[in-house]
């Protein structure tokens, strides 16, 4: 069964940021700013054709 | 530190798992200067199909 889409699970550490409870709440400014920066960053990295987007962003303590 | 986990979607056949990881790793320096994000411990794997229906791209 081919969907025409390939999915990749990616995980990484951001070592210069501290995890706090606001990263568990999508309504906080800290969560939304970090999510926006990460989304923008991935659009920059994979700007060649083929990149469809990202989803399921989760933040956890390192 | 903060661990970030996410799912990336690409048109099938346009990128392999090695290039997903390599292109991300090569951007780390720019991520530090542009977004002030110091990135390490990058791990990439393919997501077996089918997986959670809520994982639509976008």
């Amino acid at each position: 069964l081919s969907t025409g889409v390939s999915f990749f699970f990616l995980s990484f550490h951001i070592s210069n940021l501290q995890f706090n409870s606001s990263l568990e709440d999508p309504s906080t400014d800290y969560y939304q700013e970090l999510q926006r920066d990460i989304s923008e960053m991935f659009l920059q990295i994979y700007k060649q054709g083929g990149f469809l987007g990202l989803s399921n962003i989760k933040f956890r303590p390192g | 530190s903060v661990v970030v986990q996410l799912t990336l979607a690409f048109r099938e056949g346009t990128i392999n798992v090695h290039d997903v990881e390599t292109q991300f790793n090569q951007y780390k320096t720019e991520a530090a200067s542009r977004y002030n994000l110091t990135i390490s411990d990058v791990s990439v794997s393919d997501v077996p199909f089918p997986f959670s229906a809520q994982s639509g791209a976008g």
């Epitope: 390939s6 060649q48 054709g49 083929g50 | 099938e12 056949g13 346009t14 990128i15 392999n16 798992v17 090695h18 390599t22 090569q26 393919d46 077996p48």
Partner: antibody, heavy 120, light 107 residues
Framework: QVQLVQSGAEVKKPGASVKVSCKAS????????MHWIKQAPGQGLEWIGY????????HYNQKFKDKATLTRDKSASTAYMELYSLRSEDTAVYYC?????????????WGQGTLVTVSS | DIQMTQSPSSLSASVGDRVTITCRAS??????LVWYQQKPGKSPKLLVY???TLTDGVPSRFSGSGSGTQYSLTISSLQPEDVATYYC?????????FGSGTKLEIK
């Protein structure tokens, strides 16, 4: 037309080093990744690693990371592979091969091969 | 590392025969599978990429198929000029491993 022309055959003594060149023409050298492949006499193909001539990024098969170093000279449109601490099992034909451009996961052009013989 | 198991290692067939070579990957390589033909004393030549796309100039008697971990190269009607060794290659993840080769001969 695209051409990859490799340097000539080499005979080396055990413990020596050798540098094989691969001169590219007929395309923009910096926009295509260059790979290197080993083929021992009568044997199959073994991937050594690659260099991205534009960024100078290299990636090696772990098996060859202490055996080979990949470099390039952009001005000469030439890729190089240096092999160190040669042993008899390094005797092989070594090929350079160009990876196709964006989303092209194959080797579309190959050099003619360079035979490296290690013998005392 | 992904291991590529190619079979058979050698094959003898008659002109006009239908010939199939198979390649099994130790993990899902998502159709990032390439086939090359190598004639004695020559460099390998690209035949098929993305498991089933025939490269320009390759005769239509060659075809590739498969998905996941199982792939095959078929020659629908063997010709004398097809005598060669055929290799599959994983292009999904490093190291970009090759199969051990199938030596094809004419009976």
């Amino acid at each position: 037309q695209v051409q990859l022309v490799q340097s000539g055959a080499e005979v080396k003594k055990p413990g020596a080093s050798v540098k094989v060149s691969c001169k590219a023409s007929g395309y923009t050298f910096t926009t295509y990744t260059m790979h290197w492949i080993k083929q021992a006499p009568g044997q199959g193909l073994e991937w050594i690693g690659y260099i991205n001539p534009g960024s100078d990024y290299t990636h090696y098969n772990q098996k060859f990371k202490d055996k080979a170093t990949l470099t390039r000279d952009k001005s000469a449109s030439t890729a190089y592979m240096e092999l160190y601490s040669l042993r008899s099992e390094d005797t092989a034909v070594y090929y350079c091969a160009r990876q196709g451009n964006y989303a092209a996961y194959y080797f579309d052009y190959w050099g003619q091969g360079t035979l490296v013989t290690v013998s005392s | 590392d992904i291991q590529m198991t190619q079979s058979p290692s050698s094959l003898s067939a008659s002109v006009g025969d239908r010939v199939t070579i198979t390649c099994r990957a130790s993990g899902n390589i998502h159709n990032f599978l390439v086939w090359y033909q190598q004639k004695p004393g020559k460099s390998p030549k690209l035949l098929v990429y993305n498991a089933k796309t025939l490269t320009d100039g390759v005769p239509s008697r060659f075809s590739g198929s498969g998905s996941g971990t199982q792939y095959s190269l078929t020659i629908s009607s063997l010709q004398p000029e097809d005598v060669a060794t055929y290799y599959c290659q994983n292009f999904w993840n490093v190291p970009f491993t090759f199969g051990s080769g199938t030596k094809l001969e004419i009976k």
